[in-house]
Interface confidence: low
């Protein structure tokens, strides 16, 4: 049975040319975190594998950072980078647990983060 | 002694296909990701896709959709299965095995794909 729950930053918001943490956290589970995946709608963004490390897909390595943690950072942001993001915990015995961030990435300069919110 | 041998290399008309094969031996292969890189005549080396366990598969743009990375774990070996070859898909064609944080530290000798009719 899985019992636990991924809290992510939510919707954000942030200015063209800024950067941006990506963050979710798997609390109340005793699972075990095998490979941490980021996804951008049907791209892979990068890859933490609790053996190997962190793998950022090389169309992007110029763009995203690996951390902090187990979080992503995006720089130079466009407003093509708009749209959702997803973090997908694999985890044993538990399986696949997924958090979903909404990223807007804004003209002007008035980008205010939204609020947390939780994806059982 | 870490070694990659590549091999499937040839002469092919343009829209054809071929499948290279990178035979690894000397480190645990499915705890590790492999690349496929290519040098083309006077060209700097680029990366062309890279493949972990589990299937995870990463593409350069000029070759999504056309080509297809993989690896048999069984037989310690990595393929690149090349289709709609182009002529400047021409180049020596590498294996690699890639580090954590997408640095290659062993490569193979190479094998040519020449793509022209």
């Known amino acids: 049975m899985m019992t636990g729950t991924i809290e992510t930053t939510g919707n954000i918001s942030a200015e063209k040319g800024g950067s941006i943490i990506l963050q979710c956290h798997l609390s109340s589970t005793t699972a075990q975190v095998t490979q941490v995946n980021w996804e951008q709608q049907d791209q892979l963004l990068a890859i933490c594998n609790a053996d190997l490390g962190w793998h950022i897909s090389p169309s992007f390595k110029d763009r995203v950072a690996p951390g902090p943690g187990l979080g992503l950072t995006l720089q130079s942001l466009t407003v093509n980078d708009t749209g959702e993001y997803f973090c997908i915990y694999h985890t044993y015995p538990d399986g696949t647990y997924t958090g979903r961030i909404f990223l807007e990435v804004l003209e002007s300069s008035v980008a205010e983060h939204g609020a947390r919110f939780q994806i059982p | 002694e870490v070694q990659l041998v590549e091999s499937g290399g040839g002469l092919v008309q343009p829209g054809g296909s071929l499948r290279l094969s990178c035979a690894a031996s000397?480190?645990?292969?499915?705890?590790?990701?492999m690349g496929w890189f290519r040098q083309a005549p006077g060209k700097e080396r680029e990366w062309v896709a890279s493949?972990?366990?589990?299937?995870?598969?990463w593409y350069a743009d000029s070759v999504k959709g056309r080509f297809t990375i993989s690896a048999d774990n069984s037989k310690n070996t990595a393929y690149l299965q090349m289709s709609s070859l182009k002529p400047e898909d021409t180049a020596v064609y590498y294996c690699?095995?890639?580090?954590?944080?997408?640095?290659?530290?062993?490569w193979g000798q190479g094998t040519l794909v020449t793509v022209s009719s």
């Open positions: 690699a095995r890639e580090g954590s944080g997408y640095a290659s530290d062993y």
């Open positions: 000397g480190f645990t292969f499915d705890r590790s990701w």
């Open positions: 493949v972990l366990r589990g299937g995870y598969a």
